[in-house]
């Protein structure tokens, strides 16, 4: 799998989409996991509803939400109030039994807020009670890593 880069602005919401073949993955729940190192496991962050017929219902874990259009074949993950520590490598997965197929490998990059030099009084800061439904979603900038680019930079 190539790795697709999604860029979002710190403090805003980032939407990651993972298209898939709806027939091939029919009846399968999906998950979003965070890659722990190049060879490490992918740690589950959030998964779709435990009844596949209700996969379109938004499920969330902390600031991350997931919803699945099983007929259209698009898994959507929303990272709300994006923070620098959210940057990293992730996977969209299709689950079957104890196995998981990778739908897409994702690199999330967090950009500095271009407004952060302004006086805090000029900034609108979303409240803790803001729901995912109300969250403003920045159109994410995405691209695939170029051939030769290293997904995991070598550690010194």
């Amino acid at each position: 799998h190539n790795t697709t880069v999604f860029q979002g602005v710190e403090g805003q919401s980032l939407q990651v989409s993972c298209p898939y073949d709806s027939m091939k993955h029919w009846g399968r729940r999906k998950a979003w996991c965070r890659q722990l190192g190049e060879k490490g496991p992918c740690q589950r962050v959030v998964s779709t509803h435990n009844l596949w017929l209700l996969s379109f219902l938004r499920r969330r874990n902390g600031s991350t939400a997931i919803t699945d259009d099983t007929l259209g074949g698009t898994l959507t993950i929303t990272l709300r109030n994006l923070q620098p520590h959210d940057a990293g490598f992730y996977q969209c997965q299709s689950l079957h039994g104890s196995e998981a197929d990778t739908l897409r490998k994702v690199l999330v990059e967090v950009l500095a807020d271009p407004l952060d030099h302004r006086d805090a009084g000029d900034l609108w800061v979303p409240g803790e009670s803001e729901s995912f439904e109300d969250a403003h979603v920045e159109h994410s900038i995405s691209r695939s890593l170029l051939e030769g680019e290293i997904p995991f930079p070598p550690t010194s």
Epitope: W26, G27, H49, N50, L51, L53, L54, R59, R60, L71
Partner: antibody
Framework: EVQLVESGGGLVQPGRSLRLSCTAS????????MSWFRQAPGKGLEWVGF??????????EYTASVKGRFTISRDGSKSIAYLQMNSLKTEDTAVYYC?????????????????WGQGTMVTVSS | DIQMTQSPSSLSASVGDRVTITCQAS??????LNWYQQKPGKAPKLLIY???NLETGVPSRFSGSGSGTDFTFTISSLQPEDIATYYC????????FGGGTKVEIK
């Protein structure tokens, strides 16, 4: 008039099978998920399982206690949903209801059930 | 599985009284909750869906509120025809019902 009518209930011995039917009228049957519920005498409501609308190709989901024993199916040409119950146990004794899932759009529905049948009694006893 | 704790299990109130029933989920269920009314010998009837939306044709004296783990169902002015058992139902994880609240007239 939108309505659901269940049939097929009765007295059956443990280990035997029974098939319940739910006949729909007054609405486009293929557009809705259909669910089965049950209520043991003097007890609360329990979800048994449901089947997706035609768009979902007859995909089914079940509660753990009936998985592998009960099968839900649907016949769009007759507007009937079925509950095939095999290997029945005494604890399956209940009034069985079929119900229609509330529809938002082609893709989306909510498991709020806005039309219910009158129920049919199933007694499992030797 | 998510447990739904409904309280009280029964209550007696006078016609015109405000009646409140609560439902508590064992974990956060967002707003994935419905309320039903069941009269003796009859099938359940959907009153409220998605925690706070009034089903078409249901009198406005019925209302629902809440999100997360705590939900409330209210009858603003109890009527004789409201004698029934009321159930909450969650669908955040599988589908489960509360134990029911039997409402009687004093």
């Amino acid at each position: 008039e939108v309505q659901l009518v269940e049939s097929g209930g009765g007295l059956v011995q443990p280990g035997r099978s029974l098939r319940l039917s739910c006949t729909a009228s007054g609405f486009t049957f293929d557009d809705h998920a259909m669910s089965w519920f049950r209520q043991a005498p003097g007890k609360g409501l329990e979800w048994v399982g449901f089947i997706g609308s035609k768009a979902y190709g007859g995909t089914t989901e079940y509660t753990a206690s009936v998985k592998g024993r009960f099968t839900i199916s649907r016949d769009g040409s007759k507007s009937i949903a079925y509950l095939q119950m095999n290997s029945l146990k005494t604890e399956d004794t209940a009034v069985y209801y079929c119900a229609r899932g509330k529809r938002y759009s082609y893709t989306y529905w909510t498991p709020a059930f806005d039309v219910w049948g009158q129920g049919t009694m199933v007694t499992v006893s030797s | 599985d998510i447990q739904m704790t409904q309280s009280p299990s029964s209550l007696s109130a006078s016609v015109g009284d405000r009646v409140t029933i609560t439902c508590q989920a064992s974990q956060d269920i967002t707003n994935y909750l419905n309320w039903y009314q069941q009269k003796p010998g009859k099938a359940p009837k959907l009153l409220i869906y998605d925690a706070s939306n009034l089903e078409t044709g249901v009198p406005s004296r019925f209302s629902g509120s809440g999100s997360g783990t705590d939900f409330t169902f209210t009858i603003s002015s109890l009527q004789p025809e409201d004698i029934a058992t009321y159930y909450c139902q969650q669908y955040d994880s599988y589908l489960t019902f509360g134990g029911g609240t039997k409402v009687e007239i004093k």
